[in-house]
Interface confidence: low
């Protein structure tokens, strides 16, 4: 018979003829021949493969290094690989979990639109036209320029996005 | 496991007072920086206040600062809120969380605080 160009699903070409891809979790020792099955060994300690496979080595698992501020969020096993999670108070850098920073205060000029929780970062906002934030801190809402009218007084110097008004006294016109 | 209880709520006419306690375990208590945060009906979350684990530094939102006093007794795993002079905007459903480097990863069931006359 001919020899085959393409496999099943689950097994793969080599030397003309199909064989089997080695499960998740177990690693390529040998290819298939005429008379012998593929064989796989299962992937060691601290190793793991997630697919159907034809890999002569494992892949380690990752390693949720402490000094970058990871910890173990779940334990590999031989099938999966070991997901990282950052230490409280702290956020993951990118979805892969590499490493963390502590999560951001708002600048000047800007104010929480929502607080940092365990699993996200701050949300800052500008300070929209009418309210102002001169510090920079991981709480602080933009607040509102101080009404110089309800204390009877006159804006003597506007506000900005980063500062009050400032407020003084009416000149009282002469006789 | 974490759990923090608040208690000390309730009925409160404007301009008066209630302290709040909430009673922290399974975890290191004096380790951690502590704080409060309300939910008033139909709104948001908002930040109160919040005290390093020591004790020794606290912040205060602008709408509750020189009426409400933030304090902690490590010996005792407990935190406190002292509120005065409040006011019916400060009606809200009142959250102690524990916190690391100034966020919060647990939070308590909440206690509820009605200023009305």
């Known amino acids: 018979p001919e020899p085959p160009t393409a496999c099943r699903e689950k097994q793969y070409l080599i030397n003309s003829q199909c064989c089997s891809l080695c499960q998740p979790g177990q690693k390529l020792v040998s290819d298939c021949t005429e008379f012998t099955e593929t064989e796989c060994l299962p992937c060691g300690e601290s190793e793991f493969l997630d697919t159907w496979n034809r890999e002569t080595h494992c892949h380690q698992h990752k390693y949720c290094d402490p000094n970058l501020g990871l910890r173990v969020q779940q334990k590999g096993t031989s099938e999966t690989d070991t997901i990282c999670t950052c230490e409280e108070g702290w956020h993951c850098t990118s979805e892969a979990c590499e490493s963390c920073v502590l999560h951001r205060s708002c600048s000047p000029g800007f104010g929480v639109k929502q607080i940092a929780t365990g699993v996200s970062d701050t949300i800052c906002e500008p300070c929209p036209v009418g309210f102002f934030s001169n510090v920079s801190s991981a709480f602080e809402k933009c607040h509102p320029w101080t009404s110089c009218e309800t204390k009877d007084l006159v804006v003597q110097q506007a506000g900005t996005n980063k500062t009050d008004v400032v407020c003084g006294p009416q000149d009282r016109l002469r006789a | 496991e974490v759990q923090l209880l608040e208690s000390g709520g309730g009925l409160v006419q404007p301009g008066g007072s209630l302290r709040l306690s909430c009673a922290a375990s399974?975890?290191?208590?004096?380790?951690?920086?502590m704080h409060w945060v309300r939910q008033a009906p139909g709104k948001g979350l908002e930040w109160v206040s919040s005290?390093?684990?020591?004790?020794?530094?606290?912040y205060y939102a602008d709408s509750v600062k020189g009426r409400f006093t933030i304090s902690r007794d490590n010996s005792k795993n407990t935190l406190y809120l002292q509120m005065n002079s409040l006011r019916a905007e400060d009606t809200a459903v009142y959250y102690c969380?524990?916190?690391?480097?100034?966020?919060?990863?647990?939070w308590g069931q909440g206690t509820l605080v009605t200023v009305s006359s």
């Open positions: 969380a524990k916190g690391h480097s100034w966020t919060f990863d647990y």
């Open positions: 399974g975890f290191t208590f004096l380790s951690y920086p």
């Open positions: 005290i390093d684990s020591r004790g020794s530094v606290t």
